[in-house]
Interface confidence: low
């Protein structure tokens, strides 16, 4: 215990990752609007931290829409330097175990686990689905193995960054390696559940792209978005098959998507999520 305390003397100075976007609209889900045009635009994908192309209908929508890839990167992606360096760290608790729980700024509302340095145990907390920090685990076991009873060296491929507490420069910040999967599936499986505007309480299912599972939600009966299925089976059929291991090579699955008041267009997404 004394060694552990000595090793982490600057724990209270740890700053959270440089991850909150400069503009709140960068966290908005892509919205192509209700109109019928077919205009190429770019949006910032909060899940992948990358600017991606989408087809804009020509009216309404939201501020997460840019005419060029460069403009999108300038406004939203510059806070996310991409690093893919292979990293290792030695036996003992990684620094991020001592960060406070951080729900992030999104509204995905997911039960996750974090290491509570006060109680010295892993506990549940509510995660919004994006951003936050690395003290965030899908399972209690993963949290315990990483922060309560860490074993020997971990080796990870990770693109996340952390502020160096000594000179405030960006450094690579490792995390215990989850299994990384690529989601190659229809774009309507990505947005968070949207209750809509009416008063009903119908049980529907939405695909939670952060955890890779279909979860129930209460639908108001009107409005909302296309991530809305009448049965768990329908949700799984539409979205779950989009999961393939990142190591498997192959083309993206292109899914035809029919949109109201608009010609059929082909959209696909590629994002990386954790899967247990």
């Amino acid at each position: 215990a004394a060694e552990e305390d000595e090793e982490f003397t600057n724990i209270t100075d740890i700053k959270p990752p440089l991850q909150k976007p400069t503009h709140s609209f960068c966290a908005m889900k892509v919205d192509d609007g209700p109109c019928r045009a077919y205009i190429k635009r770019f949006f910032f994908n909060i899940l992948t931290h990358q600017c991606e192309e989408f087809i804009y209908g020509g009216c309404e929508g939201n501020e997460n829409r840019f005419e060029s890839l460069e403009e999108c990167k300038e406004k939203c992606a510059r806070d996310y330097p991409k690093m893919t360096t292979k990293l290792t760290f030695q036996k003992g608790k990684p620094d991020f175990c001592f960060l406070e729980e951080d729900p992030g700024i999104c509204r995905g509302y997911i039960t996750r686990y974090f290491y509570n340095n006060q109680s010295k145990q892993c506990e549940r907390f509510k995660y919004g689905g994006c951003l936050g920090n690395l003290n965030n685990f899908e399972s209690l076991e993963e949290c315990k193995n990483t922060c309560e009873n860490p074993t020997s060296d971990f080796q990870v491929d990770d693109h996340r960054t952390q502020l160096n507490t000594v000179n405030n420069t960006l450094i690579n910040q490792p995390t215990k390696a989850p299994r990384r999967w690529a989601f190659h599936g229809p774009s309507w499986c990505l947005p968070p559940a949207d209750r809509g505007l009416c008063q009903a309480n119908e049980i529907r299912f939405f695909y939670n792209a952060i955890i890779g599972k279909c979860r129930p939600f209460k639908y108001s009966g009107c409005g909302g978005n296309e991530n809305n299925f009448t049965s768990k089976k329908a949700c799984i059929t539409a979205c779950k098959k989009g999961f393939i291991p990142k190591s498997i090579k192959g083309g993206l699955i292109k899914t035809k998507r029919k949109k109201k008041k608009q010609p059929v267009k082909i959209t696909y997404v590629e994002t990386f999520v954790k899967k247990t």
């Epitope: 509302y109 039960t111 907390f125 399972s139 559940a193 939405f206 939600f217 209460k218």
Partner: antibody, heavy 122, light 111 residues
Framework: EVQLQQSGTVLARPGASVKMSCKAS????????IHWVKQRPGQGLEWIGA????????TYSQKFKDKAKLTAVTSASTAFMELNSLTNDDSAVYYC???????????????WGQGTTLTVSS | DIVLTQSPASLAVSLGQRATISCRAS??????????MHWYQQKPGQPPKLLIY???KLESGVPARFSGSGSETDFTLNIHPVEEEDAATYFC?????????FGGGTKLEIK
Amino acid sequence: EVQLQQSGTVLARPGASVKMSCKASGYSFTTYWIHWVKQRPGQGLEWIGAIDPGNSDATYSQKFKDKAKLTAVTSASTAFMELNSLTNDDSAVYYCSREVYYGYDGDYFDYWGQGTTLTVSS
Amino acid sequence: DIVLTQSPASLAVSLGQRATISCRASESVSVHGTHLMHWYQQKPGQPPKLLIYAASKLESGVPARFSGSGSETDFTLNIHPVEEEDAATYFCQQSIGDPWTFGGGTKLEIK
């Protein structure tokens, strides 16, 4: 119909251990967390901990982490709570409850067992 | 731990009148616009029964005379008009973080 059926009244000696059960029916047992709550006579409700029957992940209140052990047997759709080193303070009604999760509405207890009464006496 | 303080500890309300029960949390129980505060009713010899979830949403089958409101740290349960069968103890409960905690309870008596 969703039901949580708990085992009957238990009388135990100080220092002993007891194991109570909570049998779920009417829904997919592995989909929802099962929580355990303590209520002493004429008093409030205290959260003990919860278990995810799907993978046996368990989480405990700091106060009960050395007192209670939560387990689940999916083939029997039954959750168990074992209480050890019993004292008079453990005399209470213990409830199991199902945690439900719906989108943004939060998670809460929508169904409860009828309770198991534990009396610790020498 | 998040401490939930309920007030009053007990109250007596005439039939047909309004009962108001307050629950104050020691820190915010709201996240991303969801208020993780829930209300239960408990009658002697019975387990608690869910009335209101997410601060203001009425559980299926619960009469519309029950309503909930509030956000962050201050929440209220209203019963109007009060009926005989509403005599019970009412608990608030938060689920924002472990350990989940309950208020001390409010005993409602019908005059």
